[in-house]
Amino acid sequence: MMTGTIETTGNISAEKGGSIILQCHLSSTTAQVTQVNWEQQDQLLAICNADLGWHISPSFKDRVAPGPGLGLTLQSLTVNDTGEYFCIYHTYPDGTYTGRIFLEVLESSVAEHGARFQIPHHHHHH
């Protein structure tokens, strides 16, 4: 049975040209995290593999930095970066946990972080 929950940074906003940290945290499970995938809609941004370390997708290398921790830093933001981001925790023996973050990139200086919130755990089905 999957008992874990993922806490994410939730709905966040940031200024065009700035940076933002995407963070997820898996708790309430003793499952071993074998890999974390970061995805934006239909594209892999980065992978952190427990054995092999961090690897940034070639098409995002200039704008994505690993960390802090299992999080991801997006740099040089554009309005096209607005949208859904997913942290996908591959674990053993539980399976897959998915967290969702919505990022809005704003033109002006009104950007501010949304409140942290918890989303229920679920298996990642497609």
Epitope: T34, Q43, N49, D51, L52, H55, S59
Partner: antibody
Framework: QVQLQQSGAELVRPGTSVKVSCKAS????????IEWVKQRPGQGLEWIGV????????NYKEKFKGKATLTADKSSSTAYMQLSSLTSEDSAVYFC??????????WGQGTTLTVSS | DIVMTQSHKFMSTSVGDRVSITCKAS??????VAWYQHKPGQSPKLLIY???YRYTGVPDRFTGTGSGTDFTFTISSVQAEDLAVYYC?????????FGGGTKLEIK
């Protein structure tokens, strides 16, 4: 230019072990993964495992755990794959490849292993 | 493990034809798919990575599309030198499994 030079063909007896080498040149050895791939005669490509030469971290396909052991020597920019308890099922061409996790961009020429009594 | 299925083991085509090879993942792999060309007696060559990005120096007649579970590799105008086996491979999670391969035969 980037090159991966593999050791030569091997003819070995069942039950023995063999160590295949893959010498890298033309790039920073510790900045890329080294992946290993098996191809049996008339068959497709099968991923064996991968090593991060910088950290020494390894990851294997389950069926090759206990069969293959991946190591890397940073001082000589050489990766190794040791195969143990050899049987006829291990007769194949083995490739090493430079990996960026998301793809394998340079490949060795392949090492043919024949296991026969 | 993620299973990558290439439904056609063989495909027959003529020079100048357009040909598409399909690959289906057993579960979501985002765009974490690469395509390789393997000619007899040679090492495999990378053609496409991240489902749709053409690797450096690869002719533009080779293209890739897809995301999620369904992927397609297309040669827009087949040349005689394209005779080879083509493999998809997923890089979404280890083990980095290959498809069974599709052998392109020239009529």
């Amino acid at each position: 230019q980037v090159q991966l030079q593999q050791s030569g063909a091997e003819l070995v007896r069942p039950g023995t072990s063999v160590k295949v080498s893959c010498k890298a040149s033309g790039y920073a050895f510790t900045n890329y993964l080294i992946e290993w791939v098996k191809q049996r005669p008339g068959q497709g490509l099968e991923w064996i495992g991968v090593i991060n030469p910088g950290s020494g971290g390894t990851n294997y396909k389950e069926k090759f755990k206990g069969k293959a052991t991946l190591t890397a020597d940073k001082s000589s920019s050489t990766a190794y794959m040791q195969l143990s308890s050899l049987t006829s099922e291990d007769s194949a061409v083995y490739f090493c490849a430079r990996g960026e996790y998301f793809f394998f961009d340079y490949w060795g020429q392949g090492t043919t292993l024949t296991v026969s009594s | 493990d993620i299973v990558m299925t290439q439904s056609h083991k063989f495909m027959s085509t003529s020079v100048g034809d357009r040909v598409s090879i399909t690959c289906k993942a057993s579960q979501h792999v985002s765009n974490g798919v690469a395509w390789y060309q393997h000619k007899p007696g040679q090492s495999p060559k990378l053609l496409i990575y991240s489902a749709s990005y053409r690797y450096t120096g690869v002719p533009d007649r080779f293209t890739g599309t897809g995301s999620g579970t369904d992927f397609t590799f297309t040669i827009s105008s087949v040349q005689a030198e394209d005779l080879a086996v083509y493999y998809c491979q997923q890089h979404y999670n280890t083990p980095h499994t290959f498809g069974g391969g599709t052998k392109l035969e020239i009529k």
